[in-house]
Structures are given as C-alpha cells and as structure tokens.
C-alpha cells in the first residue's frame, strides 16, 4: 500500500521538516525560516509560534516542531500548551478585573493564583478553632470542645496572626 501511495502521490515521500512544493514539480523543499512541518507529506509548512510580550520561549521552533512558550515571570500559564498568560497575585489575594485584591475577611488564598476560599467551619465537624485563619491561611481545627474537659491538656494557640479571625460559625 505504501509503495502504491508513493507512486500515486510523490508528496508522501516528503519527510517532516519539508513540504511538497507545487511550484517546483512537487519536489520536497525545506521549510522556510520560522516555519515547520511536524509530519511527512505536507504541502505547506506551518508558521512558528512567536513567544513575545507576556510569553517567553521555552523551546525554540525547529524545522520539525513548533516553538513552545511559557509566561514571563509575574504571570503564569493557562490553557493547553500555555495558550494564555494570567497575572500572579500575592498569597492572601485573588485576581479580579481590577487587578489583585485582598481576600475578604473569612476567606483565604495560600497560592499566587486562584480565588479566595472560605475558612473551614470547624464546628461543622464538631471541632473548635485551634489556630485563627488569616488572608493567607485557613483556620486550624482542634479537638472538639467536649474533648477539652477540665483537667485535659489543651494546646496553647499561637499569637494571633496579622489579621486574626475565627471561622464563620
């Protein structure tokens, strides 16, 4: 079958990194600069992706493979193949259309991306707040109040954080 196909279609003999040039009697011509073909038998080469501005080059384009981009520091990749770059924020913030904004009281974000999430409600699990939540950290739940009967040893909570707060009860 392969022999038959190559007799019928001379383009099938053109390897990756070349294209079947109709203007030159279907000769296999190398891809021009800034273009590539990742499979054989192609009649055109694809233009290389340009990584500029918010994007930076992770892997250069070659005659057989496209360039790969990531994001300039201060931004992070979104989408398949890093199709978009999105702004980083600080911990304790979330990204909005107005830029990075502090998490509202009762919520936290411990990453440079993503949204602020509500503090854990310790009482739902029958537990008490051992360490207060902050904009950057969730509350730490401790033993249930019943476990802290008189005489039982309890953990001394650390000093309050910058913006102390209890889980919404």
């Amino acid at each position: 079958f392969e022999r038959t196909r190559s007799l019928q279609d001379p383009c099938s003999n053109c390897p990756a990194g070349t294209f079947c040039d109709n203007n030159r009697n279907q000769i296999c011509s190398p891809c021009p600069p800034n273009s590539f073909s990742s499979a054989g038998g192609q009649r055109t080469c694809d233009i290389c992706r340009q990584c500029k501005g918010v994007f930076r080059t992770r892997k250069e384009c070659s005659s057989t493979s496209n360039a790969e981009c990531d994001c300039t520091p201060g931004f992070h990749c979104l989408g398949a193949g890093c199709s978009m770059c999105e702004q980083d924020c600080k911990q304790g913030q979330e990204l909005t259309k107005k830029g990075c904004k502090d998490c509202c009281f009762g919520t936290f974000n411990d990453q440079k991306r993503g949204i602020c999430r509500p503090w854990t409600n310790c009482s739902l699990d029958g537990k008490s707040v051992l360490v207060n939540g902050t904009k950057e950290r969730d509350v730490v739940c401790g033993p249930s109040p019943a476990d802290l009967s008189p005489g039982a040893s309890s953990v001394t909570p650390p000093a309050p954080a910058r913006e102390p707060g209890h889980s919404p009860q």
């Epitope: 979104l78 989408g79 978009m84 770059c85 999105e86 990204l95 909005t96 259309k97």
Partner: nanobody, 123 residues
C-alpha cells in the same frame, strides 16, 4: 495573522507625558478586553490597566491611578495609554495585550501581545 504593534515610547523627563499606541491587525479590537502590562528593568511583568469592549469599564494598578488613562479607538483598531506626571519608577517596556476568550468570566488570561515599546523616565 493576529498581531499587536506598540509605538510611542521614548525618553521623557520626570513629570512629563507620553502617549503610547497599539495597532491591532488580524482581529477586531472592539470584540475584546484589552490590557497594558509593563516590565521594568530586572523585574517581573506587571499589569498596568485594562479596558472592556466598549470602553465603559477601565481599571488601573494603584501606582498609576490618576496619572495614566487607557482608551481605545475602535475605528482605527487601536489601543492607547496616555501617561502623565511620569516618574522614574515608570521606566519599563510597555506591552499591549489582548484578553483571551472568556476574559473576566472564567479567567484573566492574555493570549496575544506585542513586542513592546520602551519608556525611559530620566532627567
């Protein structure tokens, strides 16, 4: 081919003004949120301002509020950044960038940006 090309950068004294332009080709600017971002020497990329499709929403990073104005000339398929009361800390390469599909709803990702134009504020 979808492209953005910035222009208008240069050397300006502290307190001076500049107007940056960004010309879009290969797509209709009025269909997208548009942004300006900048990169100061040796620093990471910083978001500066954005504007929605019809220009009714405009937002700025705190450090430029009251000094910079983002605008769009949809008829010319162009984006602008008017910069006044410039400071040394505004020295950077400025890029215009397009908000990707779903910007402001699912994400705040930028999918196309230009090569940048350099602004130097120095006496």
């Amino acid at each position: 081919q979808v492209q953005l090309q910035e222009s208008g950068g240069g050397l300006v004294q502290p307190g001076g003004s500049l107007r940056l332009s960004c010309a879009a080709t290969g797509f209709t600017l009025s269909n997208y949120w548009m942004n300006w971002v900048r990169q100061a020497p040796g620093k990471g990329l910083e978001w500066v301002a954005n504007i929605n499709q019809d220009g009714s929403e405009r937002y700025y990073v705190d450090s430029v509020k009251g000094r910079f104005t983002i605008s769009r000339g949809n008829a010319k398929n162009s984006l602008y950044l008017q910069m006044s009361s410039l400071r040394a800390e505004d020295t950077a390469v400025y890029f215009c960038a397009r908000g990707g599909e779903g910007y402001g709803v699912d994400h705040y990702g930028l999918d196309v940006s230009g090569q940048g134009t350099t602004v130097t504020v120095s006496s």
